[in-house]
C-alpha cells in the first residue's frame, strides 16, 4: 500500500499556503483527486509529488494515491481543507445526473471542518427541500440525497453558518432520470392498410417512454419521411406521434412502412404493409376440400376465408338441397375477423342427419359485387343388408340387397349348421361378388347394390350369409333353408318367413 506524506488523514491550511503531498510506493504511483487548479505534479524516483504554492478553497478535496501495477489495488488518501473565511464551500460540479432510486451526491466540500455543525441543504432562492427528502452530509464529500426521485430534479445550494449568518454555495443542478427499462414502446396503426387508388389514407406511428430523450421516425420502403411530430405527456410517459395523411393515394404510396424509435437502451421497430388497388375486390376460399364426406351422426365445420376491400355489405349461408327446404340455423353460423381485410366464416353442422346431406353455399357481397363458394356434403352410411329367396328363370336364387355409402362390397358365405353368423370353423364356401349390380346411385344418397347367388339345391342343414362392407362398417344377413321354406336371420334379430 502506498504511503502519503504528511501521514495524517486530514490537513487544514489557509489560502495562499504551500502544500506538498508526497506519495511513495513499491512501484510507480499515481495521484487521483478532484479536478482542481494550481497543482503541479512531478515524479521523483518511486514517489509522486503533488504541490501548490498558492492553495485556494478550490483545492479542498480528497487526494488518493494508488499503485496502478498493484493487483490488490491498495491506496492511501488524505483530505485537504483550505479554510477560506469568505468561501466555506468548494463545489465540484455544476450538475449531478443520477437515475431514480440511486443516491445523489451533491459535491459541496466544506473548506473548514469546524463549520460542519451548521450546514444544511436548501433549494435555490432559499426554498426548503421537498417533503420526504432524505439526505445526509459528509464534510469530505458533500450532501447525499438518498434514493433520489424524479420530482427532486431541482437546483440546490449548500448552506453553512459563518459568524451567525448563512453563506450559500453556488448552485448545483440535480437531474434525476427515470430508469429506462428498454427501447420506447411503439404502435403503428393500422397494422395493414388497403385503399383503392384515389381514396384517402392515414398511418399513425407513435412511441412512448418514461424518459423524454428518444427519437422516432416513420419510413416508407427504407426512405425516412419528413413528418411533423406531436409531443405529449400523460400517464407519466412522454409520447411522440407521427401522422402521415394521404389525401389521394396512388400506387407509389404502396409498400412497407416502418415505425422506428430509439433511445440509449436501443431500438424498436414495427412494420405494416400498405396495398393500393385499382378497384374493390372480394375473394372467397377454403382450406378444406369443397367436396366433403362425413359419417352420419358425426359433426362438420365448414370454413370460408374471405378477403375483401371495402368491407362486406352482407353474407349468409344457404342450403341448396336436395332433401328439404330447411336453412342453416343462424346460431350455427360464426364469423371471426382475422384482421381488417380477412375474415373467416364457419358453419357448424353437429350430429349430421340424413336429410342434411347436400350443397351448402356461402354468399358474400361488397361494392365489388357478390361471390359464392359451394360445398357438397355427402354422408357415409354403414351397409344395411337383406336377403330373399326367389326363382329367376326357373332357377333358385338368393338375392342380397345392400345399401350404404360408399358403395358396399358383397361377399357370400356358405357354412354348416344353422347360425346367425358364419364363423371361420363352419365356413364351407366363400364367393366374392366383384361387380354387384347397382340398383340406385344418386348424389347425396346411399348406393344400393344387388348380388345374386344361384343355388341349384338348398342344403337344409346349412346357412347362407350375405355380408356387405364399406369404409364405414359392415352388415350381414343369414338365410337358413328349412323344409317348409326358409328362415332368414338379420343381424341381432330373428325373422320367420313362411
Amino acid at each position: 500500500i502506498p504511503v502519503i506524506e504528511p501521514s495524517v488523514p486530514e490537513l487544514v491550511v489557509k489560502p495562499g499556503a504551500t502544500v506538498t503531498l508526497r506519495c511513495v510506493g513499491n512501484g510507480s504511483v499515481e495521484w487521483d483527486g478532484p479536478p482542481s487548479p494550481h497543482w503541479t505534479l512531478y515524479s521523483d524516483g518511486s514517489s509522486s509529488i503533488l504541490s501548490t504554492n498558492n492553495a485556494t478553497f478550490q483545492n479542498t478535496g480528497t487526494y488518493r494515491c494508488t499503485e496502478p501495477g498493484d493487483p490488490l489495488g491498495g491506496s492511501a488518501a488524505i483530505h485537504l481543507y483550505v479554510k477560506d473565511p469568505a468561501r466555506p464551500w468548494n463545489v465540484l460540479a455544476q450538475e449531478v445526473v443520477v437515475f431514480e432510486d440511486q443516491d445523489a451526491l451533491l459535491p459541496c466540500l466544506l473548506t473548514d471542518p469546524v463549520l460542519e455543525a451548521g450546514v444544511s441543504l436548501v433549494r435555490v432562492r432559499g426554498r426548503p427541500l421537498m417533503r420526504h427528502t432524505n439526505y445526509s452530509f459528509s464534510p469530505w464529500h458533500g450532501f447525499t440525497i438518498h434514493r433520489a426521485k424524479f420530482i427532486q430534479s431541482q437546483d440546490y445550494q449548500c448552506s453553512a453558518l459563518m459568524g451567525g449568518r448563512k453563506v450559500m454555495s453556488i448552485s448545483i443542478r440535480l437531474k434525476v432520470q427515470k430508469v429506462i427499462p428498454g427501447p420506447p414502446a411503439l404502435t403503428l396503426v393500422p397494422a395493414e392498410l388497403v385503399r383503392i387508388r384515389g381514396e384517402a389514407a392515414q398511418i399513425v406511428c407513435s412511441a412512448s417512454s418514461v424518459d423524454v430523450n428518444f427519437d422516432v421516425f416513420l419510413q416508407h420502403n427504407n426512405t425516412k419521411l419528413a413528418i411533423p411530430q406531436q409531443s405529449d405527456f400523460h400517464n407519466n410517459r412522454y409520447q411522440k406521434v407521427l401522422t402521415l395523411n394521404l389525401d389521394q393515394v396512388d400506387f407509389q404510396h404502396a409498400g412497407n412502412y416502418s415505425c422506428v424509435a430509439s433511445n440509449v437502451q436501443g431500438k424498436h421497430s414495427t412494420s405494416m404493409f400498405f396495398r393500393v388497388v385499382e378497384s374493390a375486390y372480394l375473394n372467397l376460399s377454403s382450406e378444406q376440400n369443397l367436396i366433403q364426406e362425413v359419417t352420419v351422426g358425426e359433426g362438420l365445420n365448414l370454413k370460408v376465408m374471405v378477403e375483401a376491400y371495402p368491407g362486406l355489405q352482407g353474407f349468409n349461408w344457404t342450403y341448396l338441397g336436395p332433401f328439404s327446404d330447411h336453412q342453416p340455423e343462424p346460431k350455427l353460423a360464426n364469423a371471426t375477423t382475422k384482421d381488417t381485410y380477412r375474415h373467416t366464416f364457419t358453419l357448424s353442422l353437429p350430429r349430421l342427419k340424413p336429410s342434411e346431406a347436400g350443397r351448402y353455399s356461402f354468399l358474400a357481397r361488397n361494392p365489388g359485387g357478390w361471390r359464392a363458394l359451394t360445398f357438397e356434403l355427402t354422408l357415409r352410411y354403414p351397409p344395411e343388408v337383406s336377403v330373399i329367396w326367389t326363382f329367376i328363370n326357373g332357377s333358385g336364387t338368393l338375392l342380397c340387397a345392400a345399401s350404404g355409402y360408399p358403395q358396399p362390397n358383397v361377399t357370400w358365405l356358405q357354412c354348416s349348421g344353422h347360425t346367425d353368423r358364419c364363423d371361420e370353423a363352419q365356413v364351407l364356401q366363400v364367393w366374392d361378388d366383384p361387380y354387384p349390380e347397382v340398383l340406385s346411385q344418386e348424389p347425396f344418397h346411399k348406393v344400393t347394390v344387388q348380388s345374386l347367388l344361384t343355388v341349384e339345391t338348398l342344403e337344409h342343414n346349412q346357412t347362407y350369409e350375405c355380408r356387405a362392407h364399406n369404409s364405414v362398417g359392415s352388415g350381414s344377413w343369414a338365410f337358413i333353408p328349412i323344409s317348409a321354406g326358409a328362415h332368414t336371420h338379420p343381424p341381432d334379430e330373428f325373422l320367420f318367413t313362411p
Epitope: W31, P34, H38, L41
Partner: antibody, heavy 117, light 110 residues
Framework: QVQLQESGPGLVKPSETLSLTCTVS????????WSWIRQPPGKGLEWIGY???????NYSPSLKSRVTFSVDTSKNQFSLKLSSVTAADTAVYFC???????????WGQGTLVTVSS | QSVLTQPPSASGTPGQRVTISCSGS????????VNWYQQLPGTAPKLLIY???QRPSGVPDRFSGSKSGTSASLAISGLQSEDEADYYC???????????FGGGTKLTVL
C-alpha cells in the same frame, strides 16, 4: 494499460440529438475525471465538459445549455448527449481521462460525427 | 477563438531546435501548470509535457517545456521528420473551472 473507445452514429440530422458513448478499460470511471473534447475538421481542440465521481459534471459555458453527460459504472461507460445540433457541431469527438494536475492524460482514438440532412 | 494563443505554424530542418510559444492570462497559465499535446496526422492527441516541464515515460528528452508568468513554451531539439505534427498547449482556467486549449501550431519539418 488504460484504453478509451468512442462509439455512436457517424451521421446526425440537424436539430436532432447527437449521442456518443465512451467505453473505458484498464481504469475505473469511479476514479479520476473523464472529459469529452471535440475537434472540427481542420481546426483546434475544444473542451466540452467533464464528469467526476457519482455523476458530478462541469460543462463548457458555450455548450452548457445543450450538453448532458451520463454514466454507467456497471459497464464502465460514460455518454455524451448534445441536443439541437447544427452543421457547426460536425467534428471528431474524443473522450479522455484526467487526473490532478493533468487534464487529459489518456485519449480515445476519436469518432467523426457529421451533422447533415 | 481559443483562450490560449499559439502561432499557427512553425518549421525547422532536421536536427534543428524549434520553440513553440503559448500565451494566456493570470486565470490560466498565470496560476496553473501547462500541458502540451502532440497530434500526429489522423490520430488522437498524445500527452507530451505535463506540469510545465514533466515528461511522461516514453517521451524523448528532445522535448522540453517551460513556463514564465502567463506564457509557456515547448522546445524540440534535434528535430526529426516524425515530429511533424500539430502541437497544442492546455491549462486549467480558474474562471472557467475547466481546461482551455491553445489554437494549435502546425510544425513542418523541412
Amino acid at each position: 494499460q488504460v484504453q478509451l473507445q468512442e462509439s455512436g452514429p457517424g451521421l446526425v440530422k440537424p436539430s436532432e440529438t447527437l449521442s456518443l458513448t465512451c467505453t473505458v478499460s484498464g481504469a475505473s470511471i469511479s476514479s479520476y475525471y473523464w472529459s469529452w473534447i471535440r475537434q472540427p475538421p481542420g481546426k483546434g481542440l475544444e473542451w466540452i465538459g467533464y464528469f467526476y465521481y457519482s455523476g458530478s459534471t462541469n460543462y463548457s459555458p458555450s455548450l452548457k445549455s445543450r450538453v448532458t453527460f451520463s454514466v454507467d459504472t456497471s459497464k464502465n461507460q460514460f455518454s455524451l448527449k448534445l441536443s439541437s445540433v447544427t452543421a457547426a457541431d460536425t467534428a471528431v469527438y474524443f473522450c479522455a481521462r484526467g487526473k490532478v494536475g493533468v487534464p487529459f492524460d489518456y485519449w480515445g482514438q476519436g469518432t467523426l460525427v457529421t451533422v447533415s440532412s | 477563438q481559443s483562450v490560449l494563443t499559439q502561432p499557427p505554424s512553425a518549421s525547422g530542418t532536421p536536427g534543428q531546435r524549434v520553440t513553440i510559444s503559448c500565451s494566456g492570462s493570470s486565470s490560466n497559465i498565470g496560476s496553473n501548470t501547462v500541458n502540451w499535446y502532440q497530434q500526429l496526422p489522423g490520430t488522437a492527441p498524445k500527452l507530451l509535457i505535463y506540469s510545465n516541464n514533466q515528461r511522461p515515460s516514453g517521451v524523448p528528452d528532445r522535448f522540453s517545456g517551460s513556463k514564465s508568468g502567463t506564457s509557456a513554451s515547448l522546445a524540440i531539439s534535434g528535430l526529426q521528420s516524425e515530429d511533424e505534427a500539430d502541437y497544442y498547449c492546455a491549462a486549467w482556467d480558474d474562471s472557467l473551472n475547466g481546461p482551455v486549449f491553445g489554437g494549435g501550431t502546425k510544425l513542418t519539418v523541412l
